[in-house]
């Protein structure tokens, strides 16, 4: 038994036929010693007397509000709730399994940007006697604060004969660092109470994995002269992180009729405009995704083909010029290599995802995970890799990125990736390895050697351990190169002479 909140206790029960239940001792919160009686809920039947009451809790009939009285006066209450465990698994009767992205997904969370603000939601068919309480933190062993509001009923839907209720909650990380590479996941815990049943649900994620931008805004069409094409332009959604030269999006533009089976025109672009073929009765739709990290696409923003206006919306990502940087010059050239680094880091992002796209859909946060990934260098809040830090002095950040590149380059060349089980012959790990080396060489200043971090002695003995470690390393690399790519994109846009 444990205390959920003041005067509310949860009794954990193994739930099987003829289970002995749990013996619970209740103590009346009073200085009185004599003449105390106990009742349950609205019943006036006296269950026992004395300052303590010992009960055997086996079923829901044994749970409820126990009250101690003296001479008709209420002294204190103790509400007992039951938490059922069947075959070693805690019950999940209150919430509905959303089955997306995988089975046993009861809580789903999304973030519109990297500000540390996110929304979680869950579904139930229960309409009354239902309460939720939400807690959250960053990390579990040394938790950092995340503040969550109250859960509210956000939608009601009819599903066949049943009504389905959606509840949601908004949370905000207390000291968010949008530009940093997350190393510890956000933990969300929901306590659900229906009548006398208690259940708890948890979710663990990085903000980067739950990013779903809002749809692009201000879609505008302009017919192109001497062509069947129209130019569609749009703008970044207001809710997306800024500056856009750092937090960049990529877009998918699609022209399609009302039916998904109809023919379509489709093009992907990093710009905020595209030329497409518009057909009568069709619509142009645009959606957005983080440019450097493959999280969710936004919903579509649409405009009918018939409404070809002439005004031009949308704006490029640009940014104002900043101070120069001591990034190594391109051999044989005189200007800093921000643009080259940008291209190579974007290639690294693509390779890191193609090296194992499935990694993104595997839940690898298992026991011992923190010790594995803690050995990996992360781009942290104080590393100067945020837009302001880059403007002030990009050297701190570039040195950190260089260390990370060397570290991952060594890891990818180590026994973890070269040992059994052999990598699939078409795995892009080789290309990834070469590109990491290429970018680290671009970054290394002339005649100056930054100190590099020691490679941890990660020597998995079993092939399955090696496989798991590969997944974890690639997953971590995806996050690292995304931050590096943002740094170089922003540098190319604002720090290049």
């Amino acid at each position: 038994i444990w205390e959920l909140k003041k005067d509310v206790y949860v009794v954990e029960l193994d739930w099987y036929p003829d289970a002995p239940g749990e013996m619970v001792v209740l103590t009346c919160d009073t200085p009185e010693e004599d003449g105390i009686t106990w009742t349950l809920d609205q019943s006036s039947e006296v269950l026992g007397s004395g300052k303590t009451l010992t009960i055997q809790v086996k079923e829901f009939g044994d749970a409820g509000q126990y009250t101690c009285h003296k001479g008709g006066e209420v002294l204190s209450h103790s509400l007992l709730l039951l938490h059922k465990k069947e075959d070693g698994i805690w019950s999940t009767d209150i919430l509905k399994d959303q089955k997306e992205p995988k089975n046993k997904t009861f809580l789903r969370c999304e973030a519109k940007n990297y500000s540390g603000r996110f929304t979680c939601w869950w579904l139930t068919t229960i309409s009354t006697d239902l309460t939720f309480s939400v807690k959250s933190s960053r990390g579990s062993s040394d938790p950092q604060g995340v503040t969550c509001g109250a859960a509210t009923l956000s939608a009601e839907r009819v599903r066949g004969d049943n009504k389905e209720y959606e509840y949601s909650v908004e949370c905000q990380e207390d000291s968010a660092c949008p530009a940093a590479e997350e190393s510890l996941p956000i933990e969300v815990m929901v306590d659900a109470v229906h009548k006398l049943k208690y259940e708890n649900y948890t979710s663990s994620f990085f903000i980067r994995d739950i990013i779903k931008p809002d749809p692009p805004k201000n879609l505008q069409l302009k017919p192109l002269k001497n062509s069947r094409q129209v130019e569609v332009s749009w703008e970044y959604p207001d809710t997306w992180s800024t500056p856009h030269s750092y937090f960049s999006l990529t877009f998918c533009v699609q022209v399609q009729g009302k039916s998904k089976r109809e023919k379509k025109d489709r093009v992907f672009t990093d710009k905020t405009s595209a030329a497409v073929i518009c057909r009568k009765n069709a619509s142009i739709s645009v959606r957005a995704q983080d440019r450097y990290y493959s999280s969710s696409w936004s919903e579509w923003a649409s405009v009918p083909c018939s409404g070809s206006g002439s005004s031009r919306g949308g704006s490029g990502s640009g940014g104002s010029g900043g101070g120069g940087s001591k990034l190594r010059a391109v051999p044989g050239g005189s200007s800093p290599a921000w643009t080259q680094c940008q291209q190579l880091s974007q290639k690294l992002c693509t390779l890191a995802w193609s090296a194992h796209p499935l990694v993104g859909h595997m839940d690898l946060r298992e026991e011992g995970d923190e010790e594995t990934t803690n050995d990996v260098p992360h781009i942290q809040c104080g590393d100067g890799c945020d837009p302001q830090g880059l403007r002030d002095n990009s050297q701190f950040c570039l040195q950190r990125i260089h260390q990370g590149l060397i570290f991952y380059e060594k890891l990818l060349g180590s026994d973890i990736f070269t040992g059994e089980p052999s990598l699939l012959p078409d795995s892009p790990v080789g290309q990834l390895h070469a590109s990491l080396l290429g970018l680290s060489q671009l970054l290394q200043p002339e005649g100056h050697h930054w100190e590099t971090q020691q490679i941890p002695s990660l020597s998995p003995s079993q092939p399955w351990q090696r496989l798991l470690l590969r997944f974890k390393i690639l997953r971590s690399l995806q996050a690292f190169v995304a931050v590096a790519a943002r740094v170089f994109a922003h540098g190319a846009a604002t720090l290049s002479p």
Partner: antibody, heavy 118, light 107 residues
Framework: QVQLVQSGAEVKKPGASVKVSCKAS????????LHWVRQAPGQGLEWMGW????????EYAPKFQGRVTMTTDTSTSTAYMELRSLRSDDTAVYYC???????????WGQGTMVTVSS | EIVMTQSPATLSVSPGERATLSCRAS??????LHWYQQKPGQAPRLLIY???QSISGIPARFSGSGSGTEFTLTISSLQSEDFAVYYC?????????FGGGTKVEIK
């Protein structure tokens, strides 16, 4: 399944015109875009243009603008590509292809060899 | 127009070996890049669309990667039926253009 059957080989004199046909089957003709791509002997592929059989809209590569006409006959599910003012360097295999997506080529015809020789 | 450059022009590989074909665009084309295979006397066949998306019916040994200006088609373990010419094609803007092709021949 979706199939495209093209007309037979042609031999033409310089300055003449050629009209190649492409008969579609296995799908609703107006549901797919139709493209024409050519390939000179021993050379690579060259896109000529597309037509939307639903409304007759076309877009031609600048290189062929004014010299090519693409048409369709929905009653017979057939597409046509006419190339005028033929030159010897128009000698090539001409392919029609169809796709629900406008910008790449999923289903190809078997090709029609057009030889331009005096 | 966007110029697509493929390299190498010819690639000599032994059966069972891995083949890596490159395609470079003259300007950034995001992932608007598609790969085709053509055997002598046959029409081309679509292998990969939008840089990395696989086509049902195409063996899993064919994979694509890349974005921006540099793209790669990888054939993990060459089978006898894979010796052919491979073309990349950009769909970023009209006119649609192809690379010059890479001939994969038996070593």
């Amino acid at each position: 399944q979706v199939q495209l059957v093209q007309s037979g080989a042609e031999v033409k004199k310089p300055g003449a015109s050629v009209k190649v046909s492409c008969k579609a089957s296995g799908y609703t003709f107006t549901d797919y875009y139709l493209h024409w791509v050519r390939q000179a002997p021993g050379q690579g592929l060259e896109w000529m243009g597309w037509i939307d059989p639903e409304n007759g809209d076309t877009e031609y590569a600048p290189k062929f603008q004014g010299r090519v006409t693409m048409t369709t006959d929905t009653s017979t599910s057939t597409a046509y590509m006419e190339l005028r003012s033929l030159r010897s360097d128009d000698t090539a295999v001409y392919y029609c292809n169809a796709n629900k997506e406008l910008r790449y080529f999923d289903v190809w015809g078997q090709g029609t060899m057009v030889t331009v020789s005096s | 127009e966007i110029v697509m450059t493929q390299s190498p022009a010819t690639l000599s590989v032994s059966p069972g070996e891995r083949a890596t074909l490159s395609c470079r665009a003259s300007q950034s084309i995001s992932i608007n890049l598609h790969w085709y295979q053509q055997k002598p006397g046959q029409a081309p066949r679509l292998l990969i669309y939008f840089a990395s998306q696989s086509i049902s019916g195409i063996p899993a040994r064919f994979s694509g990667s890349g974005s921006g200006t540099e793209f790669t088609l990888t054939i993990s373990s060459l089978q006898s039926e894979d010796f052919a010419v491979y073309y990349c094609q950009q769909s970023n803007s009209f006119p649609l253009t192809f690379g010059g092709g890479t001939k994969v021949e038996i070593k």
